[in-house]
Each structure stands twice: as structure tokens, then as C-alpha cells.
């Protein structure tokens, strides 16, 4: 632990102003694991005037940073960029004559606070203004800066020509595209300072370029995936003050396709798993030894988990027995075509007959094949249907 | 049970149209293509085309693509396919078929007599 | 469109005996989501056609389990393990993996 300092398994506080810091402190080697400090605490650095780019990319799970009453004047740019945890930043009473919000951007700060230092009127900290309208808390910082006449004047006043948040304007055509196809999305950005513009696509699967100038880009995606379905396309318009960003969401539409089809497994109820893919929303259809299975409160449907084009579920049955032996296929369609699954069910063993043995269709109980499924003039034969798992109700009619 | 029933026996004159319907029961009307097949007098079984009764997207055999037209009203789950500028050689029975790429379900056909 | 072709036209058989009727597709009629969309049908006279086998070898609800359905690809077979006098009647293979869909045609007769 460096002099003037204390360390434990997650903190480092230096606050002993003698013989004090000249540079952020760094661990030893063989000590504690940096990735492991969560604070740094420093206070009464007079000579710590820097932090340079390197200082702090090895703490990268620290959350609160504090340099109070200290000498700090330059925060590289590059300082935080691995420390994505940061959350609380303290600054108070330093020698910081300007701060520029890249050091800050990729961060989800909820606190930073700069009071007490000697800012410098100027666009460059036009941002600090602008990130304390928008919180308008009560706990507003009383920041100052000083002006061309060496005059302290409140940063809530600050009025300085041609220097505002820029603005980002995406033309987008309708973002539902139909997988495969390409689009192109087309944005302008407008601002004083003149901002820069660049596309935030996320992870997105599909292949993509963009052309940029400083205030027009377009961004074409080609051969579009069905797994980019629901994500945000961003055109963001970024300056000194602060960025601006329009959004929009991908809808990409496509073919189902039944990716998990198992056999029943038995649970509170019995369950034939499944999870297809597909949107629009797929319409799901079961048969049952090749007829319409038409569902019932006995045998459903149900849709456990929907994660956005996904769909998890079951063919619930309740109580089947060995009438529900059979094979059950499962298509699903939407208007872009449709996919098709099946599996044989093995509920339990004929009565009386050896569970091993057992016939795995329950074609035995049709007999008279003269009155079967699709002879359809007859309305008494029910031969086509699934037989109910209501123990109540031997026919194959649910209601 | 699913049932498929079409409508009855009809006589046309050649050049004249016939609309043949197929009520759907048992099932969701709406959840399952119907397909139309004919089968002329002594020959084998020919596919027309199919319908989309959610949507009521069509698709039609290259043969009787501009002469067909299938429809549906799913308010009375049924199914219609009218057949335009007939001929002798139009004189079969018409089934209306479901529900998937087997066809599981027939109507029990409808006799359509082309004849001066 | 793709053609099927039946053989044999004319099946004499044996009431109690096995038959079996061979179906040929011009091409193959394995779908792009990985079935197979071939079903045979059995047409009675005066009736209208009737579902046996599906998807190649699943029988279809009800049906007696004297009829089987087998082949691949190209080629596919139905067998009656023991005709029945009830078994009499026009037999169909018909594909329903490409559009148009199409049928062949045979005859089953009973001796």
C-alpha cells in the first residue's frame, strides 16, 4: 500500500497529507487484487495534480472514487474507460479549471460533484450546466466559474454564444423488414459546436455499414437476421455541451421454425416441451395421429416464457392414460411460412398388459373402420379426435 | 368431430360461373388452410389451389390461375370457390380439403355438370 | 410440377393376402423444413378420398394397422398386411411439399 495510504481487501483511503501523494496510488503486485477495491478515498493531496490515463484502469470494479482537498488539475480522457462500475465521483475542492464530459459519457453516474473547484468560463464546461438542469434536484452543487474578468460567477448563469446540446433527426422508412432483405436508415445531425455523428447499433448480427460526413450519415444493413428483431438502431449527435440521440427499433419479420420439440415429460401436469421462433407471432396447431387436436381444458396450449420472437411452452394434459399414446405433431405458421415437428407420446402401458409390451398407438380401440375420421358424413363416429384425458369422460368430447 | 360439408349438385351452361361452398365445423375455422381438389369422372384427383381463411390469402394451380376464386365468410366458417368461363371439361366433383400439407379432412364433393 | 407415378395400376389380390403399391416422385419431396409430405388415400367408389398414411408412415387416426407406409426421397411404398374386403377401392399417393400439389393414381382390386 503506497505511503500515506491504507489499504484493506476493497478500500484505499489516503488522507495523511504528510509526507502525502504525487501520483494516484497504485497497489504492489503481490498485495491486494485491484479488481477487488470497490472505494477509493483520498483527502489532503496537495501534490496529487493528475490522473493519467493508466492510473485507474485497473480497478475495474471500483464503484465510489473521492480526491477531495487535493491538487488534482488534468483528468486524462481515457481515465474511467474500464471502470464501467463507477457510480459516485467526488472532485470537491480541487484545482480543475476545466473537465470534459468524455471522461464521463460511457459511465452510469449517479452522482458526480465538482464543487469548489476553479472552472474556467468557457464552452467546455457548458456540459456541467447542462448534466445540473437536468437532474434539478433539490441537492443542486452551488458551482462557479470564473470569467474573462477573473469574476466567480454561478455556473447557473453561465450564457456563452453558439454553444448548445446538438440535436439528431434519423429519417427511418418503416423498420419492419422481412429477414433477409436490406435497409437503410439515413440521419442528420445539427448543433453549435458543430457536433460529430455516429451510429450506436448495439450488438447487432446483421451486416452493416455506415457513411458519415459531420452532419449527414446513412447506415445501410444488408441481409438482415432474424436475431437483430427488436433491437434499437441509434444515430447520435455528439459535442462539447452534450449528445442527442433518435431512435429506432428493428422489427424483422421471418419464417418459424420449431427449434426445441421433445417428449412429454410429467411434472404437476404432463407436458410435451417446445419453444419455436417466429414473427409475426406464430400460430400454433396440434394433431394428434394426423387429425386436428382441438384443445380442451384437459390438453392446452400454454406459453410459459415469450423472450420477444421466442416462445417457450407445452401441450399441457392432465391426467393423460394410455387412449393418449400416439404422435403429436406441431406446426407453426405465421403469413412468412411455417415449420412442422413431431414426437411419439408414451403416457402409460395398456391396462393389464405388461408396461414394455405395450402397442404405442392406440389403434386397437377403432375397429369398425368403415365409421373412421374423415368419413365425413357420419356424426356419430369421433375416431379423428383425441381421446379426453378427463378420467369422467371416455367419448373424446371435452364439453 | 370436424366436418366438411359442401353445397349441392349443379348444372351450369359453358361460359357460365359456379360457386361451390364447404361449411367447416369441430374445429377453429380460422387456424387451418382449406384446399379445393376436382376430380372429373373416371380420372384422377387435381389440385386447384388453397385458402388462407384468417387472412383470406389465396394460392391457385398455374392451370386455373385467372378462372378461380376462392373465398371465405369466416362469420359462417365456410369456404367458397367459384369457377369462371366453364367448359365441358370443367365437369367434375369438387372437394374442398383440410387442413394441412395431408389432407387429414374431405368434403363429401360437390357434382358440377358442364353441359349445353 | 413434380409427377407422381404409381405401379401398379391393377393390384389382383387375395382377400387375407398382402399387397403393396410402389409410388415414384419426379423429384424429391423432402420439404425445406426437413418433412416429407407424402400421404396415400383411399378412395372407395362413390366416396369421397380418404386420409391412411401421412408424412410417409404415420397412420392416420383410426386407421387399421394393416396399412403401412414406407419409403424416402423418391420412393415410397404402401403395404396392406392382410386385404380386407373393405380394402377395395382407388389408392392415392399425393405430395404436399411442392405446389402444385399432385397425385398419382392406382387401383386396388379383390379376387
Known amino acids: 500500500c503506497p505511503t500515506s495510504c491504507k489499504c484493506s481487501a476493497s478500500r484505499i483511503w489516503c488522507s495523511d497529507p504528510s509526507p502525502g501523494i504525487v501520483a494516484f496510488p497504485r497497489l504492489e503486485p503481490n498485495s491486494v487484487d485491484p479488481e477487488n477495491i470497490t472505494e477509493i478515498f483520498i483527502a489532503n493531496q496537495k501534490r496529487l495534480e493528475i490522473i493519467n490515463e493508466d492510473d485507474v484502469e485497473a480497478y475495474v470494479g471500483l464503484r465510489n472514487l473521492t480526491i477531495v482537498d487535493s491538487g488534482l488539475k488534468f483528468v486524462a480522457h481515457k481515465a474511467f474507460l474500464k471502470n464501467s462500475n463507477l457510480q459516485h465521483i467526488n472532485f470537491t475542492r480541487n484545482k480543475l479549471t476545466s473537465l470534459s464530459r468524455k471522461h464521463f459519457r460511457h459511465l452510469d453516474l449517479s452522482e458526480l460533484i465538482l464543487v469548489g473547484n476553479p472552472f474556467t468560463c468557457s464552452c467546455d464546461i457548458m456540459w456541467i450546466k447542462t448534466l445540473q438542469e437536468a437532474k434539478s434536484s433539490p441537492d443542486t452543487q452551488d458551482l462557479y466559474c470564473l470569467n474573462e474578468s477573473s469574476k466567480n460567477i454561478p455556473l447557473a448563469n453561465l450564457q456563452i454564444p453558439n454553444c448548445g446540446l446538438p440535436s439528431a433527426n434519423l429519417a427511418a422508412p418503416n423498420l419492419t423488414v422481412e429477414e433477409g432483405k436490406s435497409i437503410t436508415l439515413s440521419c442528420s445531425v445539427a448543433g453549435d459546436p458543430v457536433p460529430n455523428m455516429y451510429w450506436d447499433v448495439g450488438n447487432l448480427v446483421s451486416k452493416h455499414m455506415n457513411e458519415t460526413s459531420h452532419t449527414q450519415g446513412s447506415l445501410r444493413i444488408t441481409n438482415i437476421s432474424s436475431d437483430d428483431s427488436g433491437k434499437q438502431i441509434s444515430c447520435v449527435a455528439e459535442n462539447l455541451v452534450g449528445e442527442d440521440q433518435d431512435s429506432v427499433n428493428l422489427t424483422v419479420h421471418f419464417a418459424p421454425t420449431i427449434t426445441f420439440l421433445e417428449s412429454p415429460t410429467s411434472d404437476h401436469h404432463w407436458c410435451i416441451p417446445f419453444t419455436v421462433k417466429g414473427n409475426p407471432k406464430p400460430a400454433l396447431q396440434w394433431f394428434y395421429n394426423g387429425a386436428i387436436l382441438n384443445e380442451s381444458k384437459y390438453i392446452c396450449t400454454k406459453i410459459h416464457v415469450t423472450n420477444h420472437t421466442e416462445y417457450h411452452g407445452c401441450l399441457q394434459l392432465d391426467n393423460p392414460t394410455h387412449m393418449n399414446n400416439g404422435d403429436y405433431t406441431l406446426i407453426a405458421k405465421n403469413e412468412y411460412g411455417k415449420d412442422e415437428k413431431q414426437i411419439s407420446a408414451h403416457f402409460m402401458g395398456w391396462p393389464g398388459i405388461d408396461d414394455g409390451a405395450n402397442p404405442n398407438y392406440p389403434d386397437v380401440i377403432y375397429e369398425d373402420y368403415g365409421t373412421a375420421a374423415n368419413d365425413i358424413g357420419d356424426t356419430t363416429n369421433r375416431s379423428n379426435e383425441i381421446p379426453s384425458t378427463d378420467v369422467t369422460d371416455k367419448t373424446g368430447r371435452e364439453h | 368431430q370436424v366436418q366438411l360439408v359442401q353445397s349441392g349438385a349443379e348444372v351450369k351452361k359453358p361460359g357460365a360461373s359456379v360457386k361451390v361452398s364447404c361449411k367447416a365445423s369441430?374445429?377453429?375455422?380460422?387456424?387451418?388452410?382449406m384446399h379445393w381438389v376436382r376430380q372429373a369422372p373416371g380420372q384422377g384427383l387435381e389440385w386447384m389451389g388453397w385458402i388462407d381463411p384468417n387472412s383470406g390469402g389465396t394460392r391457385y394451380a398455374q392451370k386455373f390461375q385467372g378462372r378461380v376464386t376462392m373465398t371465405r365468410d369466416t362469420s359462417i366458417s365456410t369456404a367458397y370457390m367459384e369457377l369462371s368461363r366453364l367448359t365441358s371439361d370443367d365437369t367434375a366433383v369438387y372437394y374442398c380439403a383440410g387442413v394441412t400439407s395431408w389432407f387429414a379432412y374431405w368434403g363429401q364433393g360437390t357434382l358440377v355438370t358442364v353441359s349445353s | 410440377d413434380v409427377v407422381m407415378t404409381q405401379s401398379p395400376l391393377s393390384l389382383p389380390v387375395t382377400l387375407g393376402q398382402p399387397a403393396s403399391i410402389s409410388c415414384r416422385s419426379s423429384?424429391?419431396?423432402?420439404?425445406?423444413?426437413?418433412?416429407?409430405?407424402l400421404s396415400w388415400l383411399q378412395q372407395r367408389p362413390g366416396q369421397p378420398p380418404r386420409l391412411l398414411i401421412y408424412k410417409i408412415s404415420n397412420r392416420f387416426s383410426g386407421v387399421p394397422d394393416r396399412f403401412s407406409g414406407s419409403g424416402a426421397g423418391t420412393d415410397f411404398t404402401l403395404k396392406i398386411s392382410r386385404v380386407e374386403a373393405e380394402d377395395v377401392g382407388v389408392y392415392y399417393c399425393?405430395?404436399?411439399?411442392?405446389?402444385?400439389?399432385?397425385f398419382g393414381q392406382g387401383k386396388l382390386e379383390i379376387k
Open positions: 423429384q424429391s419431396l423432402v420439404h425445406s423444413n426437413g418433412n416429407t409430405y
Open positions: 369441430g374445429y377453429t375455422f380460422t387456424a387451418y388452410d
Open positions: 399425393m405430395q404436399g411439399t411442392h405446389e402444385p400439389y399432385t
